[in-house]
């Protein structure tokens, strides 16, 4: 149903990373325009990106203030220059998005090797602790902070001088591994969400190799 | 629900090579690090390595580079273990494990390997 | 390398008994340390993980303490069902590496 000059959205699909969130959904509008609505489960709906043309709506500031609830959002189609029509049940054509809960499901963002430190036969990585847009008493919390030990870094480690991998975790962003004394090594991090089923893995940082501009070496 | 199963051992001479299956279901492999153990008759469990199906980043105890290789198929939600050069001492069950990070989860029942003329 | 030792490698108890196996690493594994139980014929199964976290669905009457290179796993009172093999693993870093094994019998 609706008016014959406007249709449905469909394909609703959130897009997350890092509490980044946008909803994104299809079809490019012609002669119509959307507005979103986002709720909690058990919260009242809250309209965001107004009458647009675009086909995504970036809804971070409303998913942040609490990452641990269910979210949903509908999509609203109104005749372009006309957004008082409604359809023939006397509201717009809206589409439901599928329920979204940012901690379970938001994508870990690629991490980042902040720095290496070689003391004698140890090595100090140290992965950076990523910011995001999530707010705890007007300051923004890190990855660390939102998620706590459920979230685990992975170290690979190899020589630069072969293929023989070695691994190494941790629930802070510091590892201290045990190298060679005069050898050089690349490394490599990925996070990792323990809990979840999905979504648990993050792609695999830049290779960093020591004797390049991150690192540092301490003869002891 | 999530199951591993181990299928393709068996009795094999030494220098043959065998090639172990692990299919799972009831999640994908490429969300998890999957690991090999094995345990020798009466003896304890030892590690041979992990893979990470989603990059193919593998990591083997010394002992087991360069003759196994560890492998995954994400379409056919598979693990694989090739034993090449194999040696009486290789005589054991094979397990697969899934790795939550935290902990190996899921085990398989296990596939036996007999290494013998 | 991690070198893992577990001790004892066999011990007899009674039911009702407290019971506890120990390993003790090579180096600080930062507490990345498991025990499981395997019974004959059977798959591992994993009673105790970050060293002190009980798994789902595991009996109270485990336990698992330790920081460090010292790590204890505890049985408080021995049941019947509780006749296994023990193993502590170590995924710390590779290779990953198992305990010996306890042997565990009741008299």
């Known amino acids: 149903s609706g008016t014959t000059n406007t249709v449905a959205a469909y394909n609703l699909t959130w897009k997350s990373t890092n509490f980044k969130t946008i909803l994104e959904w299809e079809p490019k509008p012609v002669n119509q325009v959307y507005t979103v609505q986002i709720s909690t489960k058990s919260g009242d709906w809250k309209s965001k990106c107004f009458y647009t043309t675009d086909t995504e709506c970036d809804l971070t500031d409303e998913i942040v203030k609490d990452v641990k609830q269910t979210y949903l959002a509908r999509v609203f189609s109104y005749p372009a220059g006309n957004v008082e029509s409604t359809g023939s049940a006397g509201e717009p054509l809206y589409e439901n998005s599928p329920e979204f809960t940012p901690y379970l499901e938001t994508n870990l963002g690629q991490p980042t090797i902040q720095s290496f430190e070689q003391v004698g036969t140890k090595v100090n990585v140290t992965v950076e602790d990523e910011r995001t847009l999530v707010r705890r008493n007007n300051t923004f919390l890190s990855l660390r902070d939102v998620f706590g030990k459920d979230l685990i870094y992975t170290l690979y480690y190899w020589k630069s001088s072969s293929s023989g991998k070695k691994t190494a975790k941790t629930n802070t962003n510091e590892f201290l591994i045990d190298v060679d004394k005069g050898e050089n090594y690349c490394f490599s991090v990925q996070a990792v969400i323990p809990s979840r089923t999905v979504n648990r893995k993050s792609t695999d940082s830049p290779v960093e190799c020591m004797g390049q501009e991150k690192g540092e070496f301490r003869e002891i | 629900q999530v199951q591993l199963v181990e299928s393709g051992g068996g009795v094999v001479q030494p220098g043959r090579s065998l090639r172990l299956s692990c299919k799972a279901s009831?999640?994908?492999?490429?969300?998890?690090?999957m690991h090999w153990v094995r345990q020798a008759p009466g003896k304890g469990l030892e590690w041979i390595g992990l893979?990470?199906?989603?990059?193919?980043?593998?990591i083997y105890d010394p002992k087991f580079q360069g003759r196994f290789t560890i492998s995954a198929d994400n379409s056919k939600n598979t693990l694989f273990l090739q034993m090449d050069s194999l040696r009486p001492e290789d005589t054991a069950v094979y397990y697969c494990?899934?790795?939550?990070?935290?902990?190996?989860?899921?085990w398989g029942q296990g596939t036996p390997v007999t290494v013998s003329s | 390398d991690i070198q893992m030792t577990q001790s004892p490698s066999s011990l007899s108890a009674s039911v009702g008994d407290r019971v506890t196996i120990t390993c003790k690493a090579s180096q600080d594994i930062r507490k990345y340390l498991n025990w499981y139980q395997q019974k004959p014929g059977k798959a591992p199964k994993l009673l105790i993980y970050?060293?002190?976290s009980l798994a789902d669905g595991v009996p109270s009457r485990f336990s698992g303490s330790g920081s460090g290179t010292d790590y204890t796993f505890t049985i408080s009172s021995l049941q019947p069902e509780d006749i296994a093999t023990y193993y502590c693993l170590q995924h710390g870093e590779s290779p990953y590496t198992f305990g010996q094994g306890t042997k565990l019998e009741i008299t």
């Open positions: 893979i990470d199906p989603e990059n193919g980043n593998t």
């Open positions: 009831g999640f994908n492999i490429k969300d998890y690090y």
């Open positions: 970050y060293a002190t």
């Open positions: 494990a899934r790795d939550n990070s935290y902990y190996f989860d899921y």
